[in-house]
Amino acid sequence: SPSPVPPSTALKELIEELVNITQNQKAPLCNGSMVWSINLTAGVYCAALESLINVSGCSAIEKTQRMLNGFCPHKVSAGQFSSLRVRDTKIEVAQFVKDLLVHLKKLFREGQFN
């Protein structure tokens, strides 16, 4: 089963993938699909997956979805939302990914890999 504590290498690989799909990108990611904004202070991997898993048919984030699935200790399915969701706030996938990226880089620099 997936480890609840992703190693630093896995986190770095996730950061690199998020960079890959956002670098110099101005066109709407996933055709401008909207996802629920999440609270980035705790349980970020599962919360991010719970939000992004509701986006289908977007090849650009499929690898990210798979990587997040490996970081989350429990099974996540579409339509599932934790209390980490920011109530009634949706943002574009591109902004979600950029916000997530900034946060994950902060965690990496602080040595917080879980």
Partner: antibody, heavy 126, light 108 residues
């Protein structure tokens, strides 16, 4: 003061090697993506390649004319960027600039910053 | 390999509006950047992400993008704006940079 200073240019014979350095100061170098750009005498700017910050993977990309001959590296402990140039050709003669890379400027690290060095001349001639 | 195409030269009288275009197949999804280079000097960024102006760049410089075309506009061109202008972007992967061939702006 934010600045980049290149060094290591000079005259080299075709087939020879040269290593350029770019010393950075005044900003958090480790967060920055860095590029090398060259300009042949009387010609336009040509993108040579880039290196991402280590946290973004540290990966490198190169323009087709230099791929396999040039290698970009960085030493964040010394705030220095390098360009190792092997199998040099006469058409590599140019002023070589190091610069912060705008494409990597999105993630709260150095957004909107743009810095170029003064350039160093590389002449490849027999 | 991916290319960006610019006109070799543009001429305007002082006070007129100069427009320099840059075309590339990936520009609908990738940002354009514009650099000014005066003789013997390093390039200076004047527009980033299609239309954003760095601090210290005069307001007469503006940028826009539509489809496969990015445009640098200098409203009320000054003699000191005479320089070479280069557009810069990346290919569709975002991994490889490319410059346009450059446009020599003459302010007569």
């Amino acid at each position: 003061e934010v600045q980049l200073v290149e060094s290591g240019g000079g005259l080299v014979k075709p087939g020879g090697s040269l290593r350029l350095s770019c010393a950075a100061s005044g900003f958090t170098f480790s967060n920055a993506w860095m590029s090398w750009v060259r300009q042949a005498p009387g010609k336009g700017l040509e993108w040579v390649g880039r290196i991402r910050s280590e946290i973004d993977g540290g990966t490198t990309n190169y323009a087709a004319p230099v791929k396999g001959r040039f290698t970009i590296s960085r030493d964040d402990s010394k705030n220095t960027l390098y360009l190792q140039m092997n199998s040099l050709k006469t058409e590599d003669t140019a002023v070589y600039y190091c610069a912060t890379d705008q494409v990597g400027a999105y993630y709260g690290d150095y957004y909107g910053m743009d810095v170029w060095g003064q350039g160093t001349l590389v002449t490849v001639s027999s | 390999s991916y290319e960006l195409t610019q006109p070799p030269s543009v001429s305007v009288s002082p006070g007129q509006t100069a427009r320099i275009t840059c075309s590339g197949d990936a520009l609908p999804e990738k940002y354009a950047y514009w650099y000014q280079q005066k003789s013997g000097q390093a390039p200076v960024l004047v527009i980033y992400e299609d239309s954003k102006r760095p601090s210290g760049i005069p307001e007469r410089f503006s940028g826009s993008s539509s489809g496969t075309m990015a445009t640098l506009t200098i409203s009320g061109a000054q003699v000191e704006d005479e320089a070479d202008y280069y557009c810069h972007s990346t290919d569709s992967s975002g991994n490889h940079g490319v410059f346009g061939g450059g446009t020599k702006l003459t302010v007569l």
